[in-house]
């Protein structure tokens, strides 16, 4: 395992659970997660005297890491003090520490509600020359609180003098006020008020909305995928709106076919997107004849706050077609991965560049997850490839050691599918009479990283090349003999010939 | 078929004010957003302002304040109330209907009315 | 706001010609530019749509194409009723700002 450095955790009993008359009491430090040994875990109990102990390392049966409680025991007046206990972790660096400060016990309490209002804009809808943001920190058990402004993450130097606390029954509530230039408020930065309380951290962070004409909105109307289509027989289209600002009113997605003709009920979904606008999915399913006879799909887009409607289309691809030829590939085994391989497949030549690509395994297809396959990007023909990696376990190749890779194309025939198969050891593979042994056009891959080499910011293939079992009546076209270089500004795809 | 008509220009004197009618037939006026365009003598086209089919408003900056889009679905009507006006407000002004499907411009517009603002 | 300008502002050509008009936006246009055309004395009419989609009834010689912010309207053979002034207009669904129209172009006889 690698050097991992330590979390630590304060490990502290309930107030009320202490009695008032107790003498001495114990408290902890858990450090947890880290490798490799040691830990070197210190106290500082200020005016007091206290004895430590410091129980032996455990393993954690999972990642294999490391964990350790250090104990310490203090007497005298320990209600009022503060204890720090301090870890160190010198392989993970030499001067690796982490300090927590805390108290003997803690008290039940009821954690504040931290919510910033800003002011209004004037009556033409203009912000004023300055913004006052007013941080209202609500219905905590009362005790000390500090508040801090942050701008984009940084801490601000704040008056903090202005901050008034009152209190109503039980609850306390305080609030601080920020001011700023509206240059500053204009710049789109975020104002975050953080709020530290026994040992927690409450936060609500607020910046300039965006404006009720969001620039940014698109929207993009998906064709089906030729899985849905010529496999599953159930295709479905998609229009996706995106980076809306969030508001009262609602989108309103409306589908409507060229023809005239009535769509069938559309299924919607919306998402909010962490940086705070809205995400809408309307997904229609289609007629697998109405689209393969050339039906066009519209999706019409209204929200309250765009000026214009929108509307996207979407019909069958026109032009030439070609079935996509599809290669399966094996990578050696790599020195520390016994149990894993990667298994690689190139799809090529298909026109148009609509493709659905499937790893099977024992006659059942694998979870989409489990492959990653590239976009479709131009040869420097006229066609499109892409990539499909697929990992796979010692576990699966020696229940069967057979893995196919489908391709489902509009233009393959007889069933809209092409596919190979390929094995981890070819030499050793039963397999059926469209198994294939491992080529002897291999992969060529840099000293980091076993497989394909990755895309855009990847390594360039080391030029040592690693060999495959060699075989004469490979399928894969004459031109692979060569070194072929796809997409510029990109690490090399390289293929190799005869090894 | 498609039609609009305006009615509301005429002359009328610096400082007044004017409510322009835009009356929609030949199509369901509630399923589109519409604009108005002014055209000065001589000049070219000069985007006013355009309500969408929520009625929500949008103004050019210059016209932000005197200028106010509004419409009446039941009546099939547009209207473009102008206050202070001024000599530079003088033009032929179109009502005109946006595209059904939206962001691909103007598909019908009015004959226009002139507006003449002198003194 | 984006701005939207129109070049040439005035060309002379013959029936016959190819005429080529362009546009630029001062910055990239999400959807939606068209291109109208207008006689003396009557409202603007549509060409094209969605930079480059022919409105009903326009005769093919008219086309349109671009996109980001350069775009152009072309006049494969120009016609005597294609004398008029042309119009180019973003029709943005996210944005409305000050110049929408370009200030468009006169195509007057040589």
């Known amino acids: 395992a690698s050097t991992q450095s330590p979390s630590v955790f304060p490990l502290t009993r309930c107030c009320k659970n202490i009695p008032s008359n107790a003498t001495s009491v114990t408290l902890g430090c858990l450090a947890t997660g880290y490798f490799p040994e040691p830990v070197m875990v210190t106290w500082d109990t200020g005016s007091l005297n206290g004895t430590t102990m410091t129980l032996p390392a455990t393993t954690l049966t999972l990642s294999g890491h490391y964990a350790t409680i250090s104990l310490l025991t203090v007497s005298g007046a320990w209600a009022k003090q503060m204890f720090t206990c301090r870890v160190a972790h010198t392989p993970s660096s030499t001067d690796w520490v982490d300090n927590k400060t805390f108290s003997v016990c803690s008290r039940d309490f009821t954690p504040p509600t931290v919510k910033i209002l800003q002011s209004s804009c004037d009556g033409g809808g203009h912000f004023p020359p300055t913004i006052q943001l007013l941080c209202l920190v609500s219905g905590y058990t009362p005790g000390t609180i500090n508040i801090t402004w942050l701008e984009d993450g940084q801490v601000m130097d704040v008056d903090l003098s202005t901050a008034s606390t009152t209190q109503e029954g039980e609850l306390a509530s305080t609030q601080s006020e920020l001011t700023l230039s509206q240059k500053h408020w204009l710049s789109d930065r975020t104002y975050t008020c953080q709020v530290t309380y026994q040992g927690h951290t409450f936060e609500d962070s607020t910046k300039k909305c965006a404006d009720s004409n969001p620039r940014g909105v698109s929207a993009y109307l998906s064709r089906p995928s030729p899985f849905d289509l010529f496999i599953r027989k159930s295709p479905t289209i998609t229009c996706l709106v995106v980076d809306l600002a969030p508001s009262k009113g609602t989108v309103n997605l409306t589908w409507s076919r060229a023809s005239g003709k009535p769509v069938n009920h559309s299924t919607r979904k919306e998402e909010k997107q962490r940086n705070g606008t809205l995400t809408v999915t309307s997904t229609l399913p289609v007629g697998t004849r109405d689209w393969i006879e050339g039906e066009t799909y519209q999706c019409r887009v209204t929200h309250p706050h765009l000026p214009r409607a929108l509307m996207r289309s979407t019909t069958k691809t026109s032009g030439p077609r070609a079935a996509p030829e599809v290669y399966a590939f094996a990578t050696p085994e790599w020195p520390g991965s016994r149990d894993k391989r990667t298994l690689a497949c190139l799809i090529q030549n298909f026109m148009p560049e609509d493709i659905s690509v499937q790893w099977l395994h024992n006659e059942v297809q694998l979870p989409d997850a489990r492959h990653s396959t590239t976009q479709p990007r131009k040869t420097k023909g006229s066609g499109f490839f892409v990539f499909s990696r697929l990992e796979v376990t010692r576990a699966e190749w020696e229940q069967k050691d057979e893995f196919i890779c489908r391709a489902v194309h509009e233009a393959a025939s007889p069933s809209q599918t092409v596919q190979r198969a390929v094995s981890v050891n070819p030499g050793l593979a039963g397999g059926s009479a469209q198994s294939q042994r491992a080529p002897d056009r291999v992969l060529c891959h840099s000293g980091q990283q076993q497989g394909l080499p990755r895309a855009a910011g990847g390594s360039v293939p080391h030029p040592r090349c690693h060999c495959g079992a060699g075989r004469a009546d490979w399928p894969g076209p004459p031109e692979l003999d060569v070194c072929v270089e796809e997409a510029e500004g990109e690490a090399p795809w390289t293929w190799t010939g005869l090894c | 078929q498609v039609q609009l008509v305006e009615s509301g220009g005429g002359l009328v004197q610096p400082g007044g004010s004017l409510r322009l009618s835009c009356a929609a037939s030949?199509?369901?006026?509630?399923?589109?957003?519409m604009t108005w365009v002014r055209q000065a003598p001589g000049k070219g086209l000069e985007y006013v302002s355009i309500?969408?089919?929520?009625?929500?408003?949008w103004y050019a900056n210059w016209a932000s304040g005197r200028f106010t889009i509004s419409r009446d679905n039941s009546k099939n009507t547009v209207y473009l109330q102008i206050d202070s006006l001024r000599a530079e407000d003088t033009a032929t002004y179109y009502c005109?209907?946006?595209?059904?499907?939206?962001?691909?411009?103007?598909?019908?517009w009015g004959q226009g009315t002139l507006v003449t603002v002198s003194s | 706001d984006i701005q939207m300008t129109q070049s040439p502002s005035s060309v002379s050509a013959s029936v016959g010609d190819r005429v080529t008009i362009t546009c630029q936006a001062s910055?990239?246009?999400?959807?939606?530019l068209a291109w109208y055309q207008q006689k003396p004395g009557q409202p603007p009419k549509l060409l094209i749509y969605?930079?480059?989609t022919l409105a009903s009834g326009v005769p093919s010689r008219f086309s349109g194409s671009g996109s980001g912010t350069e775009y152009a309207l072309k006049i494969s053979r120009l016609q005597p009723e294609d004398f008029a002034t042309y119009y180019c207009q973003h029709a943005d669904y996210a944005h409305h700002s000050d110049n929408v129209f370009g200030g468009g172009t006169k195509v007057e006889i040589k």
């Open positions: 030949g199509f369901t006026l509630s399923n589109h957003d």
């Open positions: 309500i969408n089919t929520y009625g929500n408003h």
């Open positions: 005109a209907r946006e595209t059904h499907h939206g962001s691909s411009g103007i598909d019908h």
């Open positions: 910055e990239s246009i999400y959807s939606g």
């Open positions: 969605d930079h480059s």
